[in-house]
């Protein structure tokens, strides 16, 4: 379970994103260039500092709109 305002790194960060984002998924893999502002951002915020639920949710993917 997610514990608010803590440092999250490695697999624990990935698992927490999966928990928070659920079926929406999240921005995980970098593109072929291996550069991703999103990926770098969540690492800086959540592993090297600490992050809360609201920040984690900003990395969840937006579900495709159904027609």
């Amino acid at each position: 379970a997610y514990r608010p305002s803590e440092t999250l790194c490695g697999g624990e960060l990935v698992d927490t994103l999966q928990f928070v984002c659920g079926d929406r998924g999240f921005y995980f893999s970098r593109p072929a260039s291996r550069v991703s502002r999103r990926s770098r951002g969540i690492v800086e915020e959540c592993c090297f500092r600490s992050c809360d639920l609201a920040l984690l949710e900003t990395y969840c993917a937006t579900p495709a709109k159904s027609e």
Epitope: C9, F28, S36, I42, C47
Partner: antibody, heavy 122, light 107 residues
Amino acid sequence: EVQLLESGGGLVQPGGSLRLSCAASGFTFSNYIMWWVRQAPGKGLEWVSVISSSGGGTLYADSVKGRFTISRDNSKNTLYLQMNSLRAEDTAVYYCARDNGDYVGEKGFDIWGQGTMVTVSS
Amino acid sequence: DIQMTQSPSSLSASVGDRVTITCRASQSISNYLNWYQQKPGKAPKLLIYTASTLQSGVPSRFSGSGSGTDFTLTISSLQPEDFATYYCQQSYNSPWTFGQGTKVEIK
């Protein structure tokens, strides 16, 4: 060829300082999280420190916190480890390594340097 | 901190043998377990990450399995170049910790 090359090791007295360098080549250094890992003679591997790709974030093992400082110069493709207040128990081969994943170590360390020996003794 | 315990600490085997090394975590680490091979005087080499994914360029005789707290590295048919020390490492969270190593020696 993707390569990491450490330098700066040597013999230092307890309480002394050393600065290790790790020169990267063959890949876009600024895109990767980087690590220092050490291995005392005849012993296992121990994580020392990690730095984010931009250099804006750092973490340290409790055993070196407050004494060691990790940094990087992306314009020079070089990783550093400043080691102060050295102790006998810091004697080890120090390796730099490249992160294999996206979220700080979750896929291990895929490229390692050859290591540089640090001996702390009077 | 998460403690990693490998067994056995050493083993003797012959070329062609099937070799199994186990690694146990002191708490659940999901599948965030990596395996390295180290030869004397050399740097470690990543073999397997996230428990079962073979690193690029690593021979298919190496395989990994497990989840939670119990993990296994298997060498299906030991080759002369496989005599080395093998380390497991948890990558679930900080501090990133390694097992004490398993030395695979020639019988």
